[in-house]
Amino acid sequence: MMTGTIETTGNISAKKGGSVILQCHLSSTMAQVTQVNWEQHDHSLLAIRNAELGWHIYPAFKDRVAPGPGLGLTLQSLTMNDTGEYFCTYHTYPDGTYRGRIFLEVLESSVAEHSARFQIP
């Protein structure tokens, strides 16, 4: 039975050319996290964090994605095209699959605020 909940950084904004941290947190379950996938709005995988194999950054994102902190992901050298939805998918046992959503808005403005509040989607 899936009892857990995913908390995410929710809707965030960041400056073009800057960087942003995408964070998800799985709570309210004792399930083992075997893998976390990070995906972009068009279903392309950015990175995988496997409990045994560690991090795998997909080639298309190698230059702009850094693993961590923790199970999170850091996006660097942001462009306007990075605006959109990002999903963290927690593969766990015995529960199964948990998914969290983050919406990132990349702003031209130099006064872009980076909100880091956690919320349950």
Partner: antibody
Framework: EVQLVESGGGLVKPGGSLKLSCAAS????????MSWVRQSPEKRLEWVAE????????YFPDTVTGRFTISRDNAKNTLYLEMSSLRSEDTAMYYC????????????WGQGTSVTVSS | DVQITQSPSYLAASPGETITINCRAS??????LAWYQEKPGKTNKLLIY???TLQSGIPSRFSGSGSGTDFTLTISSLEPEDFAVYYC?????????FGGGTKLEIK
């Protein structure tokens, strides 16, 4: 080319044991989680075991927990399923399958090996 | 466990036609449903995963849709090689479970 070749099936009496093998080739075996799925004579598919890439994590449905053991030898590119206390309802074709790297479903399957439990 | 009900169990169609196969889960499985093709003498083939994502190398005439409890596999402009048995499988929670299969035959 990804290839999975199962072996070790056969006829066994109720209460008996059997060890199935799956030889993998054409991919880096040690970086993929693997599963065993069986198909009953009535053609129903049932997932029976899964193991993580390094062998640390193993998972089973309640129907086989305590009777089946899944293991792997990454040096030999081989997956195993050890079955004990076999019952007539375990009669099936057993397939090994590779899980996608992102864990979404099973992307390659073997041809299967037949297991018959009968007295 | 999540029960998967697949329908129809049997379907007859002609090459060039468009067909749909349905799977219904006993509870929400988000988007996490896969579709497989089984043909005699061949290994099972993954067609669709995560509800609608086409597996690499699978022709675009195969498509998947749905989320929550109701899912559909659509094969448009049937080719002779598409006549086979199709299974759905939920990959949302353990234990992974399968539908009962749909045998697609030539009319």
């Amino acid at each position: 080319e990804v290839q999975l070749v199962e072996s070790g099936g056969g006829l066994v009496k109720p209460g008996g044991s059997l060890k199935l093998s799956c030889a993998a080739s054409g991919f880096t075996f040690s970086t993929y989680a693997m599963s065993w799925v069986r198909q009953s004579p009535e053609k129903r598919l049932e997932w029976v075991a899964e193991i993580s890439s390094g062998g640390t994590y193993t998972y089973f449905p309640d129907t086989v927990t305590g009777r089946f053991t899944i293991s792997r030898d990454n040096a030999k590119n081989t997956l195993y399923l050890e079955m004990s206390s076999l019952r007539s309802e375990d009669t099936a074709m057993y397939y090994c399958a590779r899980k996608r790297r992102d864990y979404y479903a099973m992307d390659y399957w073997g041809q299967g090996t037949s297991v018959t439990v009968s007295s | 466990d999540v029960q998967i009900t697949q329908s129809p169990s049997y379907l007859a169609a002609s090459p060039g036609e468009t067909i749909t196969i349905n799977c219904r889960a006993s509870k929400s499985i988000s988007k996490y449903l896969a579709w497989y093709q089984e043909k005699p003498g061949k290994t099972n083939k993954l067609l669709i995963y995560s509800g609608s994502t086409l597996q690499s190398g699978i022709p675009s005439r195969f498509s998947g849709s749905g989320s929550g409890t109701d899912f559909t596999l659509t094969i448009s402009s049937l080719e002779p090689e598409d006549f086979a048995v199709y299974y759905c499988q939920q990959h949302n929670e353990y234990p992974w479970t399968f539908g009962g299969g749909t045998k697609l035959e030539i009319k």
